[in-house]
Amino acid sequence: GSQHIRAEKAMVDGSWLDLAKRSKLEAQPFAHLTINATDIPSGSHKVSLSSWYHDRGWAKISNMTFSNGKLIVNQDGFYYLYANICFRHHETSGDLATEYLQLMVYVTKTSIKIPSSHTLMKGGSTKYWSGNSEFHFYSINVGGFFKLRSGEEISIEVSNPSLLDPDQDATYFGAFKVRDID
């Protein structure tokens, strides 16, 4: 009898533990933002990408804020940040201005309290995209572990925005909290 009661108590304690873990996990901030293809800037210069989806398709956000093209941190912590940017061109969409391209992404952190901006990650390459080739494609993926404070903002800059692949599985960025700051 007593064995049965102990087992039952353990089950109850375990489920409370699971529930506590689950609620803590649910409170863990995360975001996965996908490019808004209707509002991609044109040209070849470096620009900040301000139009992202946060609530459709693969895009989701929880306990973080998306505002004015920036992902805003609501909780201090160590976060894993990532970005995937795809560039593509098909001759049916027009000509390339130049065959020599610098295709880059910059993940930037901006602090409002102490006005400052830092590039956290960058990636890319110089490419030769011949005008005689029918199709071109290039993908950049960057990721890293960073200490972020509440109120800090994450934004994405790219070169050659007119060459961005507008699909949700191609151009996206995100963050998730891994642990608290001790």
Partner: antibody
């Protein structure tokens, strides 16, 4: 539909300059090279050069490089070509043109006749 | 510069027969698995019209009587069967390499 409309005929004296225009419509002006081709009376076609209107990148045939300039006004979706130090052998019909969605020049302006005569 | 030599300079073909025009390039116009050679028809007082692009592709709206073939340096435009409306001058053009160049033209007369 893609349309290229060129300015009217010009009569010029040797040594003078001429500036022709080509107004594009029916497509995004800043996404294709716009080309210039000329044809002297009874002669064949001669490719002169091209401009990529956004950043204004240009390419020219060596023969014309010193006295030929192509420009573009993106706000007017219009390209211009200027030929300086005109000679009688510059008398020709001048066409602006654009490639098709694949390759080859699928779209042509109606042509502008330039006559160089003393 | 790539020089394109067309032959013959002129030809006369009977109605319903086959017309063949040749274009030879001074160097290969092939790259990335494609041949950057195109064919145009021009009637007097009119701008040229694109017939064939990338050596063998028929431009939209062009009758199937027109066909193109060839690769690297040797290309052919074939009109079969020839119709009265085909009397015109035909040009080849390459855009594999700047500056783009045209052939000298072939004048087709219908007998």
């Amino acid at each position: 539909q893609v349309q290229l409309v060129q300015s009217g005929a010009e009569l010029k004296k040797p040594g003078a300059s001429v500036k022709l225009s080509c107004k594009a419509s029916g497509y995004t002006f800043t996404t294709y090279w716009l080309q210039w081709v000329r044809q002297a009376p009874g002669q064949g076609l001669e490719w002169m050069g091209a401009i990529y209107p956004g950043p204004g990148n240009t390419k020219y045939t060596q023969k014309f490089k010193d006295r030929f300039t192509i420009t573009a006004d993106t706000s007017k979706s219009t390209a211009y070509m200027q030929l300086n130090s005109l000679k009688s052998e510059d008398s020709a019909v001048y066409y602006c043109a654009r490639r098709g969605s694949r390759r080859g020049i699928a779209y042509w302006g109606q042509g502008t006749l330039v006559t160089v005569s003393a | 510069n790539i020089v394109l030599t067309q032959s013959p300079a002129s030809l006369a073909v009977s109605l319903g027969q086959r017309a063949t025009i040749s274009c030879r390039a001074s160097e290969s116009v092939d790259s990335y698995g494609r041949s950057f050679m195109h064919w145009y028809q021009q009637r007097p007082g009119q701008p040229p019209t694109l017939l064939i692009y990338l050596a063998s592709n028929l431009e939209s709206g062009v009758p199937v009587r027109f066909s193109g073939s060839g690769s690297r340096t040797d290309f052919t435009l074939t009109i079969d069967p020839v119709e009265a409306d085909d009397a015109a001058t035909y040009y080849c053009q390459q855009d594999n390499e700047d500056p783009y160049t045209f052939g000298g033209g072939t004048k087709l007369e219908i007998k």
